[in-house]
């Protein structure tokens, strides 16, 4: 028998994948354990085998359909379940009844890029992945800018309290290096949490022009 | 829906090998556990070995451990067998099967399968 605390995580894309994480204090590394997904309204189950991302905690993705498909609707209730072998049996490790529209979390934004860039000024725009026509426009963004010499820990937090996939950096030095993140979450879900932040976009603002000599 | 290709089947003789692929189309490859079922003549469709998802794991019956080797290549979307020290006992047809749920894929009922390809080894 395995002893200790338990927790079972797991977050909804809003399409087609649900990820999740299994923490065991205790448990062994070379067991084999499922996540096993049981919908109440549909005809399919699904399951991911759980792989170790540290000393007691698994993670795996429950790949629902192609990337865009939307697999569940807010009305959707999964049954999920740890199941890890024990000899010849499987033995339920956890469970919870998974409400998708609960438990979200997006893909990270893809496809940064620089739309226009001036000596204290940047203009960036992006794209969401993967995320439900369900949302019309009810999403929220956080952004964030690293500059030379800080951590992104330090860099302060801009938010965008409505689907602008754009953002207009201001007050920024002339000819210096930055790199941008942004980050997505639905305004639905008690659970809901802040997608991943995306790849770092690079970018350099313009050198000031040499003023005349007074 | 999805669609499975075996290949690699033929006559061989006792002591050699084989290696059979099947090859998925028509959905994302990684959601499904594949698994490797054979039928002798006259008899009903027996359970070789079985992979799940990631990879990570291969469970086969007791009369291939040792000699049969399941793997898979998610970036090629193919499921392989290879089958080494053939007895005439393999002799079969074999076929690739796929299913969403690990636990249901020994229950031959709701997967999905190739059309087979036979394996006969001489004595």
């Known amino acids: 028998a395995v002893n200790g605390t338990s927790q079972f995580t797991c977050f909804y894309n809003s399409r087609a994948n649900i990820s999740c994480v299994w923490s065991q204090d205790g448990a062994l590394q070379d067991t084999s354990c499922q996540v096993h997904a049981w919908p109440d309204r549909r005809r399919w189950n699904q399951t991911c085998e759980l792989l170790p991302v540290s000393q007691a905690s698994w993670a795996c993705n429950l790949i629902l359909g192609a990337p865009d498909s939307q697999k569940l609707t807010t009305v959707d209730i999964v049954t999920l379940r740890v199941l890890c072998r024990e000899g010849v049996r499987w033995r339920v490790m956890a469970i919870q009844d998974f409400k998708p529209f609960e438990n979200l979390r997006l893909m990270a934004p893809i496809s940064l890029q620089v739309v226009h860039v001036e000596t204290h000024r940047c203009n960036i725009s992006w794209e969401i992945s993967q995320a439900s026509h369900y949302f019309e426009r009810h999403l929220e963004f956080e952004a964030r800018t690293l500059s030379p010499g800080h951590t992104w820990e330090e860099a302060p937090l801009l938010t965008l309290k409505q689907k602008q996939e754009w953002i207009c950096l201001e007050t920024l030095t002339p000819d210096t290096q930055y790199e941008f993140q942004v980050r997505v979450k639905p305004l639905q879900g008690e659970f809901t949490t802040w997608s991943p932040w995306s790849q770092p976009l690079a970018f350099r603002t313009k050198p000031a022009a040499l003023g005349k000599d007074t | 829906e999805v669609q499975l290709v075996e290949s690699g089947g033929g006559l061989v003789q006792a002591g050699g090998s084989l290696r059979l692929s099947c090859v998925v189309s028509?959905?994302?490859?990684?959601?499904?556990?594949m698994a490797w079922f054979r039928q002798a003549p006259g008899k009903g469709r027996e359970f070789v070995a079985v992979v799940t998802d990631s990879g990570r794991t291969t469970e086969y019956v007791d009369s291939v451990k040792g000699r049969f080797t399941v793997s898979r290549d998610n970036a090629k979307n193919t499921v392989y067998l290879q089958m080494n020290n053939l007895k005439p006992e393999d002799t079969a047809v074999y076929y690739c099967a796929a299913n969403t749920d690990y636990f249901q894929i020994r229950s031959v009922d709701n997967n999905a399968w190739g059309q087979g390809t036979q394996v006969t080894v001489s004595s």
């Open positions: 028509g959905d994302v490859f990684v959601r499904y556990t």
